[in-house]
């Protein structure tokens, strides 16, 4: 996490710059949204709780061809501690719950602006 | 055309619970935040809280042990409880949306604001 | 919690005078900044939001800047619907406080 912070980062990126970092980069996504998201494709649901960075990834990793989250795969990637690829699932994600990228982009943004404002970076 | 507009009682005994209503108009209360900020004669501007489209809710600390908030979503209704009211805690009372897609918090649109007297 | 300290606390001013209001932060709050016009009696009214973007309805002439801890509301040729109290507000970390205001009267 120390080390999040884009490819273009001068050095180490203290917790809550990255999180400040993602939640703009969500807050992006989400202003610039004209057409559907991401063609509207659908993602697992996840439990926005412990653990849930490398869920968010997991989830968003299967969504192909949609250079709109494209950065925020990578800034999630420097949250989550082990490598993820597509296909790949944790007990995190909610299996019967399918949700447009769009909607999950709008709960992650949320629930990590909460964590923020409350000074929870890790 | 966005509206808040705050109810409750202008005058209440100490220790008394206060209730104050935010009725909203113009957006949903499952799209935006509503926050609640109160301001003493005179004096600056206080944040008490703020009731998350998701339900949620978070607190200003010092405030915390006293306060809650509720909302009815069918009814376009925030309710803000306040217990143990002092002499200290009158101020005009106001809800407040909050900006929400940006990654900071702000508050875009005000009630006209309820002046509450604890006496 | 963050304090916000404005200065000054109050000024006069003269119809097209230039008026800048500052607003210092005790610790880092990026951009996340927020300029409020109140008159008596009234609420708050949003000038400014993320440091320098102009909320919709509100003059030109209003204007913030800066970064970090230091930031500044400038009103470039005051009007006379200008004379009010304007407050600062971080948005960065709860509690969400305000600056003490500045109130703006007429030289």
């Known amino acids: 996490l120390t080390c999040l912070g884009g490819f273009a980062s001068p050095g180490p990126v203290p917790p809550s710059t990255a999180l400040r970092e993602l939640i703009e980069e969500l807050v992006n996504i989400t202003q610039n949204q004209k057409a559907p998201l991401c063609n509207g494709s659908m993602v697992w649901s996840i439990n926005l709780t412990a653990g849930m960075y490398c869920a968010a990834l997991e989830s968003l990793i299967n969504v192909s061809g949609c250079s709109a989250i494209e950065k925020t795969q990578r800034m999630l990637s420097g949250f989550c501690p082990h490598k993820v690829s597509a296909g790949q699932f944790s007990s995190l994600h909610v299996r019967d719950t399918k949700i447009e990228v769009a909607q999950f982009v709008k709960d992650l943004l949320l629930h990590l602006k909460k964590l923020f404002r409350e000074g929870q970076f890790n | 055309q966005v509206t808040l507009k705050e109810s409750g009682p202008v005058l209440v005994k100490p220790t008394e619970t206060l209730t104050l209503t935010c009725t909203v108009s113009g957006f949903s209360l499952t799209n935006y935040h509503v926050q609640w900020i109160r301001q003493p004669p005179g004096k600056a501007l206080e944040w008490l809280g703020v009731?998350?489209?998701?339900?949620?809710?978070s607190f200003n600390s010092v405030l915390k042990s006293r306060l809650t908030i509720s909302r009815d979503t069918s009814k376009s209704q925030v309710v803000l409880t306040m217990t143990n009211m002092d002499p200290v805690d009158t101020a005009t009372y106001y809800c407040?949306?909050?900006?929400?897609?940006?990654?900071?918090?702000?508050?875009?649109?005000w009630g006209q604001g309820t002046l509450v007297t604890v006496s | 919690d963050i304090q916000m300290t404005q200065s000054p606390s109050s000024l006069s001013a003269s119809v097209g005078d230039r008026v800048t209001i500052t607003c210092l932060a005790s610790e880092d709050i990026s951009n996340y900044l927020a300029w409020y016009q109140q008159k008596p009696g009234k609420a708050p009214k949003l000038l400014i939001y993320?440091?320098?973007r102009l909320q919709d309805g509100v003059p030109s002439r209003f204007s913030g800047s800066g970064s970090g801890t230091d930031f500044t509301l400038t009103i470039s040729s005051l009007q006379p619907e200008d004379f009010a109290t304007y407050y600062c507000?971080?948005?960065?970390?709860?509690?969400?406080?305000f600056g003490g205001g500045t109130k703006v009267e007429i030289k």
């Open positions: 993320h440091t320098s």
């Open positions: 407040a949306r909050d900006g929400t897609i940006a990654a900071m918090d702000y508050f875009d649109y």
């Open positions: 009731m998350w489209s998701d339900g949620d809710t």
């Open positions: 507000q971080q948005g960065y970390r709860f509690p969400l406080t």
